[in-house]
Each structure stands twice: as structure tokens, then as C-alpha cells.
């Protein structure tokens, strides 16, 4: 009975320990579940942050490219090459230069080419009005980029396009044939045909640089 | 003895259960420690990501401001008002306009003022060379911004500054007195004095807009 009592006491102890351990395990299990939950939350947070970081990186890359482009454009524009070079007249889409020397038509054409331009081309009555006004204080003739081989050929501009008949009437040596061809000049607002070999002033024309305007 | 055996058996079971539970607790403890470690790592990772995200946001903000500034500058520069208005000639620091109508000196002065300009002022031989060349194909006179009340007064530019004597010699009506004063015009490269009441072409001049050049 003494043994039995001792065993009973030990059993009670063991049961108590077991219950205690089971309680501990239950608590640990709950804590573990909570920890798992927390860990999942942390992982989710990490995923969100990583995604956000990735998005930010993409946006930043885009902004960086935009920046580079803007800087490039700014460099180009800040040079803001004026619409026309010095000494030229800017009018609408074109730049005009009134030559200060007298040369034959071919030489005048070469002079314009050396300036990355062509001899005057009149495309419209507005162009004609501007030129007439610009040379209103001169009594001299100015070669323009209009010529023809002989009276049986059409009047052509330097770019090969034909003269629009409504623009102006050509006076002077219209019926003449010259070995050097017949060229057109403008004087006091009227257009005349003459031997291309003659020396005259001239008007060069080129497209205005209007990118940055 | 039967009770004793039963108690011993129960005791053995309980001890086994206790040991098992202790093992479980030990395993759980290790797992918990590992989980804690992992959680700490995750937290650290979150901290790092959060810091990185914050940095990126700052950089992005900076880039965004840079972008806005660049766009602002671009807007300002892209207006890049050309050095000179249309129909004017840009030469060095100035813009020049050759009038297309004939007016007396005072009226010519008013015309220039209405264009935010003044009548031609020649400051140097380089200026003179340019003007002489620019009017080389005209035989007409052009008023400039030089005048005097009568022969006992000095020649003055519109801004009140005196004419530098070495620049050019004034020919013509230099000794004449006119009620409207004596004004200077340039023709075929030479400068002449004449009654300001006469009508002539004129040359307007203003500073070129070279900010963005």
C-alpha cells in the first residue's frame, strides 16, 4: 500500500507534468500559428515593397530617359540656331539674301549653292509681293532661279518645277534664243527674260530653320 | 500487486507521453527560434526595402523636378524668339529694317519708334561697311538717326550721343540752316546733310535678341 501510494503520487505528478506540457504545447502551437501568420504578413509586405520598388525603378528609368531627351533637345534648341543666318532676311518659311555683287546667272547660282541655298523661287503672289517690296528701293535687276533653254522650252525653276502661268508675265527677251540660255530677273516688281551671260545682282533663298520657333 | 502493476504500467505510459511531449516542446522551441530568426530576417528585409523605396522616391522626386525645370526652360527657349523679327536683317548685335516707303525724317523716326526701334546709328567702320554693302544695290537716299538744329550745333544721334568725327565726312547742305533742322542720309555709301522735311527711305535699327543664341 505504501508502494501503491507512492506510485499514485508519482502518477499524479506525471499527469500534472503531462497536462502542463500539453498546455505548453498548445500555447506553443498557438504562438507558432501566430508566428506563421505574422511571417506570412511579413512576406506579403516584402512582396508589396519589392513590387513598389520595381515600379519606382521603372518610373525612374522613364523619367531618366525623359530627362536625357529633354537635355538633348535643350542642347539642340539652346543653340537655337536663328531662323536665318546673319545678313539674311527671314520672311515666313524662307530666308533671303540679296547679293552685294554682280554676276552672270550661272555664277549667281553657284554663289547661292555655296551658301546652301538656291536662287529665288516665287511660289505664290504673297512671295511676289514680299520680293517686290523688298527690292522697292532698288532700280537694279536681280536674277531669280528661273530659266529656259530656248523659246520652245518651258520656263523652269532650279528644282525642275515649271512656272505657274498666273503668277507673273515675263517681259523682255522672251522670244530670244541665247547660247547660254534665257534667264529671268526681277526689277522694280516686274519679271524680264534676258541673256543668262549678263552680270546682275541676285537673290538667294533657303528654308528658314523654324524647328524651335 | 495487480494494482501495483497497473499503476506501473500507467506510470510508464505517462513517462513515455511526458518524454514525447518534452521532445515535441524541444522541437517546437527550435522551430520557434528558427521562426524568430526568419522573422527577424524578414523584418530586416522589409526595413531595407522600405529604405530603398524611400530613396527611390526621393530620387524620383528630384528627377521629376529636374524634368519640370527642363520643360520650363525648353518652353522659354523654344519660344527662342529669333534674333530679329521677320523681314528685318540680323547683323552682329543689331536688327535692321529698310523702309519700303518714303517719309520725312520725323515721320521716319516715328515709324521706327512704332516698331520698338530707332533710326540707324553707325557706331563703327564695321557698321558703316555693313550698311554700305546692304544698300549697294540702291541709288536712293536713306535717312539715318543723325541730325542737328543748325550749323552751330553738333551732329547728334537720336540717343543724344555725338558723332565720332573719324567715322565719315558729311557732304551736301552742311552749312545750311532749315526750320525743321538738318538731317543726315546715306546714299551709295556716302553721307549727306539735307533738309529734314524731305521724304526719303529710312533704316530702322534695334538690338538683336541674342539671349538664347
Amino acid at each position: 500500500s505504501q508502494v501503491s501510494n507512492l506510485l499514485k503520487q508519482q502518477q499524479t505528478n506525471l499527469t500534472h507534468q503531462k497536462n502542463k506540457l500539453e498546455g505548453q504545447i498548445s500555447a506553443r502551437q498557438q504562438a507558432e500559428e501566430a508566428s506563421q501568420e505574422s511571417q506570412n504578413e511579413l512576406k506579403e509586405m516584402i512582396e508589396t515593397l519589392a513590387w513598389k520598388l520595381n515600379e519606382k525603378s521603372k518610373e525612374q528609368m522613364e523619367l531618366h530617359h525623359q530627362n536625357l531627351n529633354l537635355q538633348e533637345t535643350l542642347k539642340r534648341v539652346a543653340n537655337c540656331s536663328a531662323p536665318c543666318p546673319q545678313d539674311w532676311i527671314w520672311h515666313e518659311e524662307n530666308c533671303y539674301l540679296f547679293s552685294t555683287g554682280s554676276f552672270n546667272w550661272e555664277k549667281s547660282q553657284e554663289k547661292c549653292l555655296s551658301l546652301d541655298a538656291k536662287l529665288l523661287k516665287i511660289n505664290s503672289t504673297a512671295d511676289l509681293d514680299f520680293i517686290q517690296q523688298a527690292i522697292s528701293y532698288s532700280s537694279f535687276p536681280f536674277w531669280m532661279g528661273l530659266s529656259r533653254r530656248n523659246p520652245s522650252y518651258p520656263w523652269l525653276w532650279e528644282d525642275g518645277s515649271p512656272l505657274m502661268p498666273h503668277l507673273f508675265r515675263i517681259r523682255g527677251a522672251v522670244s530670244q534664243t541665247y547660247p547660254s540660255g534665257t534667264c529671268a530677273y526681277i526689277q522694280r516688281g516686274a519679271v524680264y527674260a534676258e541673256n543668262c551671260i549678263l552680270a546682275a545682282f541676285s537673290i538667294c533663298q533657303k528654308k528658314a530653320n523654324l524647328r524651335a520657333q | 500487486s495487480q494494482v501495483s502493476n497497473l499503476l506501473k504500467q500507467q506510470q510508464t505510459n505517462l513517462t513515455h507521453q511526458k518524454n514525447k511531449l518534452e521532445g515535441q516542446i524541444s522541437a517546437r522551441q527550435q522551430a520557434e527560434e528558427a521562426s524568430q530568426e526568419s522573422q527577424n530576417e524578414l523584418k530586416e528585409m522589409i526595413e531595407t526595402l522600405a529604405w530603398k523605396l524611400n530613396e527611390k522616391s526621393k530620387e524620383q522626386m528630384e528627377l521629376h523636378h529636374q524634368n519640370l525645370n527642363l520643360q520650363e526652360t525648353l518652353k522659354r527657349v523654344a519660344n527662342c524668339s529669333a534674333p530679329c523679327p521677320q523681314d528685318w536683317i540680323w547683323h552682329e548685335e543689331n536688327c535692321y529694317l529698310f523702309s519700303t516707303g518714303s517719309f520725312n525724317w520725323e515721320k521716319s523716326q516715328e515709324k521706327c519708334l512704332s516698331l520698338d526701334a530707332k533710326l540707324l546709328k553707325i557706331n563703327s567702320t564695321a557698321d558703316l561697311d555693313f550698311i554700305q554693302q546692304a544698300i549697294s544695290y540702291s541709288s536712293f537716299p536713306f535717312w539715318m538717326g543723325l541730325s542737328r538744329r543748325n550749323p552751330s550745333y553738333p551732329w547728334l544721334w537720336e540717343d543724344g550721343s555725338p558723332l565720332m568725327p573719324h567715322l565719315f565726312r558729311i557732304r551736301g547742305a552742311v552749312s545750311q540752316t532749315y526750320p525743321s533742322g538738318t538731317c543726315a542720309y546715306i546714299q551709295r555709301g556716302a553721307v549727306y546733310a539735307e533738309n529734314c522735311i524731305l521724304a526719303a527711305f529710312s533704316i530702322c535699327q534695334k538690338k538683336a535678341n541674342l539671349r538664347a543664341q
Epitope: S139, G172, T177, Y178, P179, A193, E194, I197, L198, A200 | -
Partner: antibody, heavy 119, light 111 residues
């Protein structure tokens, strides 16, 4: 029909001046270049000057450059030659001639006017 | 200062063919057209040939012109008494920018 009629010739002392005119009719005056050509007694033709349709081109012989001035008035269909500082060697019959091109041929001529420079 | 050179005189019998030469340089005949004029005694000159070989209306086809290099020539076939006159060649000199005439050739129709 085309007509060119010179006038203004006469006797003038050396150093003197004279203005010749050439009245045109029978054609569109402003469509032609006009020349002055002279011929000294018993000599050949000597070109003097030419003016283009609206007066933009004017050319002169070296012998008259600086002394003679060619001009035209298209509203009056008239060509002029202002002759200053005249010399004995300027004595000649002065013809006006029209030209369909400044550098081309003279397809019509006037009958001429005699200028005599003598003291 | 005559720039174009012509023989002072040529002659031929009626019905014959005569030629009058006109010599210049690259700046005139060499690069421009040549014209020929006939001047009968006491009258104004009259255009005979233009653009080297073109005859204005009213000019008989007995008159013809040609050009080669820096020289030109006027040929008259079937010579007639009324052809007796002075003949002048003319061109444009682009270097001196002026009209140049030949000194003239006196054509005498013999017999």
C-alpha cells in the same frame, strides 16, 4: 509699223552738252531693249550705249563712259541720250535701234540725227 | 577700238558668190550669236542675218550666215547690183559688257 525717230542733234561746242531723243511707235516699247549707235562721217558703225526694258541694265562704250547717260521713259515711249563734255570725236550721225534682247540683234533702226561738235 | 575684224572690201561680178568673214574671240563670237547688217549709201543700217544664220522676213535667201568657233561669215550668192553696200557683223562681248561691231566691209558689184 515700227517707227523710231531721233531728234535733238545739232552743232555744239567742245565741252558742251546735248540731249538726244528717240520717239518710238508701232510696238510695245517696254518689251524691247534700246541702243544708241553712231557713225562718224565716212566711218563704220560704233555702238554707244544700251538700256534694258525698264532701265535695269545700262551699258556704255568706253569712249563715252562717264560723259553720256542713257535713259528711257516708258510712259512716253521715248529713249534719251544725255551727252556732256562733248568732244570733236563725238561728231557723228546718232541712230537709235531697238533690240528684242539686250545682247541680241537690232531689228529696227531710226534714220539718225547728226551731232556736230566744233568750235 | 574695233573688236571684230572684217576685210575692208570685197567685190564680185553679178551672179557670183561672195563671202565676208568676221573674226572675233571667245568672249564675243565664241560665246554669243552674230548678226549682220547691210547699209546702203545714205541710209540707216538694216538687219540681214541674226542668231548666226536666221534671216528676218523680207530678206532674200541669197543671203546666208554661218558661224564656226570664234569666226562668222556672210555669204551672198547670185550677186546683184543693189547688193552694193557696206556690211557689218555684230555680236555681244560678255567680258567688256558691250555690243561690238566689225569695221565694215564695202561690197562692190563689178561691171
Amino acid at each position: 509699223q515700227v517707227q523710231l525717230l531721233e531728234s535733238g542733234g545739232g552743232l555744239v561746242q567742245p565741252g558742251g552738252s546735248l540731249r538726244l531723243s528717240c520717239a518710238a511707235s508701232g510696238f510695245t516699247f517696254s518689251d524691247y531693249a534700246l541702243h544708241w549707235v553712231r557713225q562718224a562721217p565716212g566711218k563704220g558703225l560704233e555702238w554707244v550705249s544700251v538700256i534694258s526694258y525698264a532701265g535695269g541694265f545700262k551699258f556704255y562704250a568706253d569712249s563715252v563712259k562717264g560723259r553720256f547717260t542713257i535713259s528711257r521713259d516708258n510712259s512716253k515711249n521715248t529713249l534719251y541720250l544725255q551727252m556732256n563734255s562733248l568732244r570733236a570725236e563725238d561728231t557723228a550721225v546718232y541712230y537709235c535701234a531697238r533690240s528684242p534682247g539686250l545682247t541680241s540683234y537690232h531689228d529696227s533702226w531710226g534714220q539718225g540725227t547728226l551731232v556736230t561738235v566744233s568750235s | 577700238d574695233i573688236v571684230l575684224t572684217q576685210p575692208p572690201s570685197v567685190s564680185g561680178a553679178p551672179g557670183q558668190r561672195v563671202t565676208i568673214s568676221c573674226s572675233g574671240s571667245s568672249s564675243n563670237i565664241g560665246s554669243n550669236y552674230v548678226s549682220w547688217y547691210q547699209q546702203l549709201p545714205g541710209t540707216a543700217p538694216k538687219l540681214l542675218i541674226h542668231s548666226n544664220s536666221h534671216r528676218p522676213s523680207g530678206v532674200p535667201d541669197r543671203f546666208s550666215g554661218s558661224k564656226s568657233g570664234t569666226s562668222a561669215s556672210l555669204a551672198i550668192t547670185g550677186l546683184q547690183a543693189e547688193d552694193e553696200a557696206d556690211y557689218y557683223c555684230q555680236s555681244w562681248d560678255y567680258e567688256s559688257e558691250r555690243v561690238v561691231f566689225g569695221g565694215g566691209t564695202k561690197l562692190t558689184v563689178l561691171g
